[in-house]
């Protein structure tokens, strides 16, 4: 099969010539989650941006060693992040820049919900949300 | 094809001011964090200033620190570096640099022409 | 935070030139490498402690553990001869070495 039959469903939705999955992470604290691009055509590095609100635009994201890695072969990029935390929140959205053309293909985007309480203010709200 | 190009550079005397500019083509501006980078004449690279795509976080050295602003337009796709109180050791070409990748702590594989800054009398 | 690296370094055509940069605990940042000959911008060699960006030859590399990261050119050319400067990340701000300078004999 073409990747790009088997990367529209379920994997991932088709944007442009990427196809990114999963379109959606839920996680506890402190686990690790990998989102990966597949892409039609290698001729091009592929990045990461996030946006934590909907109505911005997204930003690079900040280097941990250890905690953040990208890579990529030759139809796959995979970004992976390790010990998650409240603040990794958002939707990522892998981009490839094509060396050629030097048009930019954007993901569908992936977000990543961090489950559990950051702080204790939070935990305060939740209860008074329940009662 | 990702370009910057600094301007603003010249003569000034020390104690005055002087405004650079980077114009930016060939990505979203807005989603990347920008720096300044010097290099006074005869010596080596010095990191100056980074702010954020959105403009709302800046970080300086502390060489420059309350005396230089870095700021962005991200409609005009420019960068800026207004430098006050200016001294004779701030003497250098003045670069715009991008890490152009996923993160804005990379390596800075983006960089300008540069433009010279002379602080004299 | 402080990066320091040899002023010089000569090497023959063909053999393996080595830059060192130390810093405490650098192997606990990325490393990155850039190339400056006179008149012209960095080009940056080496990100990421170890990878090379497209289009510079394979013969570069890099490490970086302890205190110590390391650029390594194997079979060096004579357009190889330029200025090096090592570069991490305290925190939120960038910090150079002074720079080395390759002379290929």
């Known amino acids: 099969a073409r990747s790009e039959d088997r990367y529209r469903n379920p994997k991932g939705s088709a944007c442009s010539r990427i196809w990114q999955s999963p379109r959606f992470i839920a996680r506890k604290r402190g686990f690790t989650v990998k989102m990966h691009c597949y892409m039609n055509s290698a001729s091009g590095n592929v990045s990461w941006l996030w946006k934590q609100e909907m109505d911005e635009n997204p930003q690079q994201l900040k280097l941990e060693k250890g905690r953040m890695e990208e890579s990529q072969n030759e139809s796959l990029a995979t970004l992976t992040i390790q010990g998650i935390r409240f603040e990794d929140n958002g939707i990522y959205f892998c981009q490839q820049k094509c060396n050629n053309t030097s048009e930019v293909y954007q993901g569908c985007g992936t977000e990543l919900r961090v489950m559990g309480f950051s702080t204790l203010a939070q935990l305060k709200q939740r209860n008074t949300l329940k009662d | 094809e990702v370009q910057l190009v600094e301007s603003g550079g010249g003569l000034v005397q020390p104690g005055g001011s002087l405004r650079l500019s980077c114009a930016a083509s060939g990505f979203t501006f807005s989603s990347y964090a920008m720096n300044w980078v010097r290099q006074a004449p005869g010596k080596g690279l010095e990191w100056v200033s980074t702010?954020?795509?959105?403009?709302?976080?800046?970080y300086y050295a502390d060489s420059v620190k309350g005396r230089f602003t870095i700021s962005r337009d991200n409609s005009k796709n420019t960068l800026y570096l207004q430098m006050n109180s200016l001294r004779a050791e701030d003497t250098a070409v003045y670069y715009c640099a991008n890490p152009s990748g996923t993160f804005w702590n990379d390596a800075f594989d983006i960089w300008g022409q540069g433009t010279m800054v002379t602080v004299s009398s | 935070y402080e990066l320091t690296q040899p002023p010089s370094v000569s090497v023959s055509p063909g053999q393996t030139a080595s830059i060192t940069c130390s810093g405490d605990?650098?192997?606990?940042?990325?490393a990155s490498w850039y190339q400056q000959k006179p008149g012209q911008s960095p080009v940056v060699v080496i990100y990421?402690?170890?990878k090379r960006p497209s289009g510079i030859p394979e013969r570069f590399s890099g490490s970086n553990s302890g205190n110590t990261a390391t650029l390594t050119i194997s079979g060096t050319q004579a357009m190889d001869e330029a200025d090096y400067y090592c570069q991490a990340w305290d925190s939120n701000t960038a910090v150079f070495g002074g720079g080395t300078k390759l002379t290929v004999l």
């Open positions: 990421q402690d170890t």
């Open positions: 702010i954020s795509g959105s403009g709302g976080s800046s």
């Open positions: 605990k650098l192997g606990d940042e990325f």
